[in-house]
Interface confidence: low
């Protein structure tokens, strides 16, 4: 089976603009790609299956997304801990200042969180 987790965080050194409401824009696609790449770095272990439903909201930039793991490989606490441990690396590697991290279980079907 698969476990899903809803993750929300702020990128305080980026500015939200209307292009982040349009998935066809360069800014949206570049930010989505870079965040996807970052999560592949954070959750390198075999249980990580990927992420989906990336959304951007105003508030500098608020990022909301869903993470998928093989069932039983990780829990909410570990998802949050690993992400928080990575924050300084995110600053150096991706020039992202991350704050206000929130993680929760996603009840099936996970698309309800989108």
């Amino acid at each position: 089976g698969v476990s899903f987790f809803f993750l929300s965080f702020h990128i305080s050194n980026l500015q939200f603009n209307s292009s982040l409401e349009d998935p066809s824009t360069d800014y949206y696609q570049e930010l989505q790609r870079d965040i996807s790449e970052m999560f592949l770095q954070i959750y390198k272990q075999g249980g990580f299956l990927g992420l989906s439903n990336i959304k951007f909201r105003p508030g500098s930039v608020v990022v909301q997304l869903t993470l998928a793991f093989r069932e039983g490989t990780i829990n909410v606490h570990d998802v949050e801990t690993q992400f928080n441990q990575y924050k300084t690396e995110a600053a150096s590697r991706y020039n992202l200042t991350i704050s206000d991290v929130s993680v929760s279980d996603v009840p099936f079907p996970f698309s309800a969180q989108s």
């Epitope: 980026l14 570049e30 930010l31 870079d34 441990q85 300084t88 150096s92 991706y94 020039n95 992202l96």
Partner: antibody, heavy 123, light 111 residues
Framework: EVQLVQSGAEVKKPGASVKVSCKAS????????IEWVRERPGHGLEWMGE????????NYNEKFKGRVTFTADTSTNTVYMELSSLTSEDTAVYYC????????????????WGQGTTVTVSS | DIVMTQSPDSLAVSLGERATINCRAS??????????IHWYQQKPGQPPKLLIY???NLETGVPDRFSGSGSRTDFTLTISSLQAEDVAVYYC?????????FGGGTKVEIK
Amino acid sequence: EVQLVQSGAEVKKPGASVKVSCKASGYRFIPYWIEWVRERPGHGLEWMGEILPGTGRTNYNEKFKGRVTFTADTSTNTVYMELSSLTSEDTAVYYCARYGDDTSGGYYAVDYWGQGTTVTVSS
Amino acid sequence: DIVMTQSPDSLAVSLGERATINCRASESVNILGTNLIHWYQQKPGQPPKLLIYHASNLETGVPDRFSGSGSRTDFTLTISSLQAEDVAVYYCLQSRKIPWTFGGGTKVEIK
């Protein structure tokens, strides 16, 4: 003052292994990546990989995967690079370097380097 | 891997004249507006020395005759007025994607 001091020159036989040390001082050791770069005669600079001492997290250049291992000892602020199955092609100067944020403005770059360790592989 | 193509291989410039070195990446090294390209100077028997980080930022203590420019895939290191102590090999480095890759180097000499 940030310093990276590497171990001395080594001469090895083909097929052997070499372990190079890099002792860091003058900064907080744990949160900064240490990069390993080598310079082969006539071949320029080549990135081998990196280690984050605080977690032991590593990233390797696929070219060296399986032959190179990075380790860190946080009690002595020392990072080690071990390269196995040596051939004459591994004759090079090996550098450790810090991926740090002492650049003005807080941006990150490889800013401080060790003095280099010459490894000669010869039968 | 991102391939960094540096040109020219060598460059002979008169003292006081301008030296220009180019580096082209096989794909964009830009991330969220930051170009993850750095320039290093290496003299014989010494480790590389950071000159320019993130394409255009001058490292502390580096003379302002050195400057960097460019974005995404095409980058330039300029020495506005070459001095005798600038004789060295210059390298670009991309830290956008693992494995990090260096350009092949440009040897700068006095004409």
